[in-house]
């Protein structure tokens, strides 16, 4: 259930280099960019995926109101520093010695500073709100069918336990998926909600990270669910620290 033995590939991460040089000639895969070994039976961490993406050729590609502390990833792509477990390091810096603090999904949560900036801990993102707008359909989707299909998708495609899908809201054409996972709830082996959300985001954009598996074909009672816009809000266990200057 790790890397596929027959042709030595990584089913859960196409941005890898695999070879049969693991113990006993087993297939072992390493992430592009970092060279770190990855577990191909589960999702690869977002940090390693971003690093791989930056190293790859550049052509490769009842509704909830988000709280005032919700973060949106406005900064976009950067080449992150990952720790030995593949998580984001709390402090990220660019080549010009500009530094900032990030949360567990790699989204900036402070103003930018210089090399003297301190980020004491990696703050966990415990609540993610995925806000989708679907293309017009003949009628609205049945809410409970939509709810069931999205929960099943997160379980079966992204291996995220259903208990971490807190709610699915629907007011045509807006769908909101709430993922919640506190530090105390996440057991060893559990997929992180940030990683699941990132894989989902890439799937929605038609940039699937899975190897050999078809792209995302989401249907509700046979009707295709086609997304035309996605916004993801991240809520951290400790609110972010931005100066008032940014808020005006």
């Amino acid at each position: 259930h790790t890397a596929a033995q027959d042709n030595c590939t990584c089913p859960t991460n196409k941005m890898t280099v695999c070879s049969p040089d693991g113990p006993g000639g087993r297939c072992q895969c390493r992430a592009l960019g970092s060279g770190m070994a990855v577990d191909c039976s589960t999702l690869t961490s977002k940090c390693l995926l971003l690093k791989a993406r930056m190293s790859a050729p550049k052509n490769a590609r009842t509704l909830v109101r988000p709280s005032e502390h919700a973060l949106v990833d406005n900064d976009g792509l950067y080449d992150p520093d990952c720790d030995p477990e593949g998580r984001f390091k709390a402090r990220q810096c660019n080549q010009t010695s500009v530094c900032w603090c990030v949360n567990s999904v790699g989204v900036r949560r402070t103003d930018k500073g210089d090399l003297s900036l301190r980020c004491d801990e990696l703050v966990r993102t415990h609540h993610i709100l995925i806000d989708l707008r679907h293309r017009p359909t003949a009628g609205a989707f049945n809410h409970s069918d939509l709810d069931a299909e999205l929960r099943r998708l997160f379980r079966e495609r992204y291996r995220l336990h259903p208990k971490f899908v807190a709610a699915v809201h629907y007011e045509q054409p807006t769908i909101q998926i709430e993922l919640r996972q506190n530090t105390s709830q996440k057991a060893a082996g559990d997929v992180d909600i940030g990683d699941a959300a990132y894989y989902f985001e890439r799937d929605i954009k038609g940039e699937s990270l899975f190897q050999g598996r078809g792209g995302l074909d989401l249907r509700v009672r046979g009707e295709p669910l086609q997304v035309e816009r996605t916004l993801i809000y991240y809520l951290d266990e400790i609110p972010p620290k931005f100066s008032m200057k940014r808020l005006t």
Partner: antibody, heavy 118, light 109 residues
Framework: QSLEESGGDLVQPGASLTLTCKAS????????ILWVRQAPGKGLEWIGC???????TYYANWAKGRFAISKTSSTTVTLQMTSLTAADTATYFC?????????????WGPGTLVTVSS | YDMTQTPASVSEPVGGTVTIKCQAS??????LAWYQQKPGQPPKLLIY???DLESGVPSRFKGSGSGTEYTLTISDLECADAATYYC????????????FGGGTEVVVK
């Protein structure tokens, strides 16, 4: 940790019946409950599943419309069956997944017998 | 997703080896389980993730395979192994007729 089914009975064709699965010794919110049946001398047949957390239900193609799974308390799940025929005569099992995201069934009830006959 | 299991029945002497095959209609990514069922009892999980042994199951039971083809091998057969064995795809609960294979009856002579 255990599961126990109840409600099995001898019923007439066309009748409805509700089976209950009672869980003890574990928190159902961390699991899914699946219903499986076995006609006398035949193989296992998957009926459907409920994600206890969230309550989403899923059914085998043949079971859609006539079978309904629901959670009725923090420890019980029911299987409602309508328009029963002789072909529904079977031992009905409820089973629990292993708490991962796969559907490995590592805890089963002893089963309850449903007989449909006139 | 349909599961086809062969053979329907097999008979081998004590100490022998039995091989049961299971084919999925689509790739199930190694998410396959094997169960043992004896008369009057519910099934018992033997192997999960195609090849991982459930705790307490003797190492005489071995699962292998990937993609759509999977195998259960029982070596050094014992009388207690006489039972019906089922494979089950544990990948999806969407659009399926039956998650289980048809079963294989193992008779130990």
């Amino acid at each position: 940790q255990s599961l126990e089914e109840s409600g099995g009975d001898l019923v007439q064709p066309g009748a409805s019946l509700t089976l209950t699965c009672k869980a003890s010794g574990f928190d159902l919110n961390n699991y899914s409950i699946l219903w499986v049946r076995q006609a006398p001398g035949k193989g296992l047949e998957w009926i459907g599943c409920i994600y206890f957390s969230g309550g989403s239900t899923y059914y085998a193609n043949w079971a859609k419309g006539r079978f309904a799974i629901s959670k009725t308390s923090s420890t019980t799940v029911t299987l409602q069956m309508t328009s029963l025929t002789a072909a529904d005569t079977a031992t009905y099992f409820c089973a629990r997944d292993d708490g991962t995201t796969s559907y490995y069934l590592n805890l089963w009830g002893p089963g309850t017998l449903v007989t449909v006959s006139s | 997703y349909d599961m086809t299991q062969t053979p329907a029945s097999v008979s081998e002497p004590v100490g022998g080896t039995v091989t049961i095959k299971c084919q999925a209609s689509e790739d199930i990514y190694n998410l396959l389980a094997w169960y043992q069922q004896k008369p009057g009892q519910p099934p018992k999980l033997l192997i999960y993730a195609a090849s991982d042994l459930e705790s307490g199951v003797p190492s005489r039971f071995k699962g292998s395979g990937s993609g759509t083809e999977y195998t259960l091998t029982i070596s050094d057969l014992e009388c207690a192994d006489a039972a019906t064995y089922y494979c089950q795809q544990a990948y999806t609960v969407g659009n399926i007729d039956n998650a289980f294979g048809g079963g294989t009856e193992v008779v130990v002579k």
